[in-house]
């Protein structure tokens, strides 16, 4: 069964900067990745980025840079311009659309006890939906 993993990492040097790492474990070719925060895409979440293997990447503030790390994983850098950091208690979700498996989504967040520079362990919340 395909699986999506999500890691959220606070940058050690910049406490207002976070990076979300997501990956797809499974066969098939990825046709689209959608990253959202505050919940799953289309279920109360707010879209942060869309990464298409052919068309490029489109991102929305406060996302700063979305990139493919490998052909099955992506990273999304976020920067909080406000005084307080809303990211620390936020859930980030990644949805991978792949052929022929369909769509698979998982969410993760920064653990409350995280020290800067430490990343959350892979947290595939079982929202795994085959759309």
């Amino acid at each position: 069964t395909p699986e999506v993993w999500v890691q959220v990492q606070m940058e050690a040097t910049e406490l207002s900067s976070f990076t979300v790492h997501c990956g797809f474990l499974g066969p098939g070719s990825i046709s689209l990745v959608t990253v959202s925060w505050g919940g799953p895409d289309g279920a109360g979440g707010t879209k942060l980025a869309v990464l298409h293997p052919e068309l490029g990447t489109r991102q929305w503030a406060p996302a700063r840079q979305a990139r493919w790390e490998t052909q099955s994983s992506i990273s999304l850098a976020l920067e909080d311009s406000g005084a307080s950091s809303p990211f620390a208690n936020t859930t980030f979700c990644c949805k991978f659309a792949s052929f022929p498996e369909g769509s698979w989504e998982s969410c993760g967040s920064l653990p409350p006890s995280s020290d800067p520079g430490l990343s959350a362990p892979p947290t595939p919340v079982p929202i795994l939906r085959a759309d």
Partner: antibody, heavy 120, light 113 residues
Framework: QVQLQQSGAELMKPGSSVNLSCKAT????????INWVKQRPGHGLEWIGE????????NYNEKFRGKATFTADTSSNTAYMQLSSLTSEDSAVYFC?????????????WGQGTSVTVSS | DIVMTQSPSSLAMSVGQKVTMSCKSS????????????LAWYQQKPGQSPKLLVY???TRESGVPDRFIGSGSGTDFTLTISNVQAEDLADYFC?????????FGGGTKLEIK
């Protein structure tokens, strides 16, 4: 032939707002993003943001957030950009441009541009 | 944001000569999936809007004469105009179409002697 027809030149007072239009013809308006680009002499081309007509989806360059607002009317195949609280820094030519089929941000068709002059 | 830097800012050439202009990006524009570079070139003639010449660094837009040749990969790109014509008098801009926000170079002004 795909065309983007923009509204005419505007002479505006500081502090006022202006609404620019971009009418699309000969393609399915709701299928393509419309980009807005600013050009000032000596400042090159700056991407203001984009809108996908037929949806509420917009995307703004952070530099222009609060300055520009995008809307679209699918019944007339027209995209709009409102610029608010105008200053001399907003004096420029503004282009609308269609995002292409093959890449999100390669812009394959451009309007002729609208010149906005802000002067008291 | 990805910073695009063009050089030279202007150049003057005679009809029939070969013109080369450069564009550098602050980060790689190479897509690991299709090995395409997300770099476009636009031509803007005086008083007109920009016109897409080349995308994916080397793919000519339909209708663009084959004397316009885009090349390069990663962070270094070149637009070459072989056998330059009088109607090529224009500003030329490179643009990364890799990610939001798309950013443009400062332009190269081509003058014809």
């Amino acid at each position: 032939q795909v065309q983007l027809q923009q509204s005419g030149a505007e002479l505006m007072k500081p502090g006022s707002s202006v609404n620019l239009s971009c009418k699309a013809t000969d393609y399915t308006f709701t299928d393509y993003w419309i980009n807005w680009v600013k050009q000032r002499p000596g400042h090159g081309l700056e991407w203001i943001g984009e809108i996908l007509p037929g949806s509420v989806t917009t995307n703004y360059n952070e530099k222009f957030r609060g300055k520009a607002t995008f809307t679209a009317d699918t019944s007339s195949n027209t995209a709009y950009m409102q610029l608010s609280s105008l200053t001399s820094e907003d004096s420029a030519v503004y282009f609308c441009a269609r995002g292409s089929d093959y890449s999100y941000y390669a812009m394959d068709y451009w309007g002729q541009g609208t010149s906005v002059t802000v002067s008291s | 944001d990805i910073v695009m830097t063009q050089s030279p800012s202007s150049l003057a050439m005679s009809v029939g000569q070969k013109v080369t202009m450069s564009c550098k990006s602050s980060q790689s524009l190479l897509n690991i999936f299709n090995q395409k570079n997300f770099l476009a070139w636009y031509q803007q003639k005086p008083g007109q809007s920009p016109k897409l010449l080349v995308y994916f660094a080397s793919t000519r837009e339909s209708g663009v004469p084959d004397r316009f040749i885009g090349s390069g990969s990663g962070t270094d790109f070149t637009l070459t105009i072989s056998n330059v014509q009088a109607e090529d008098l224009a500003d030329y801009f490179c643009q990364q179409h890799y990610s939001t926000p798309p950013t443009f170079g400062g332009g190269t002004k081509l003058e014809i002697k």
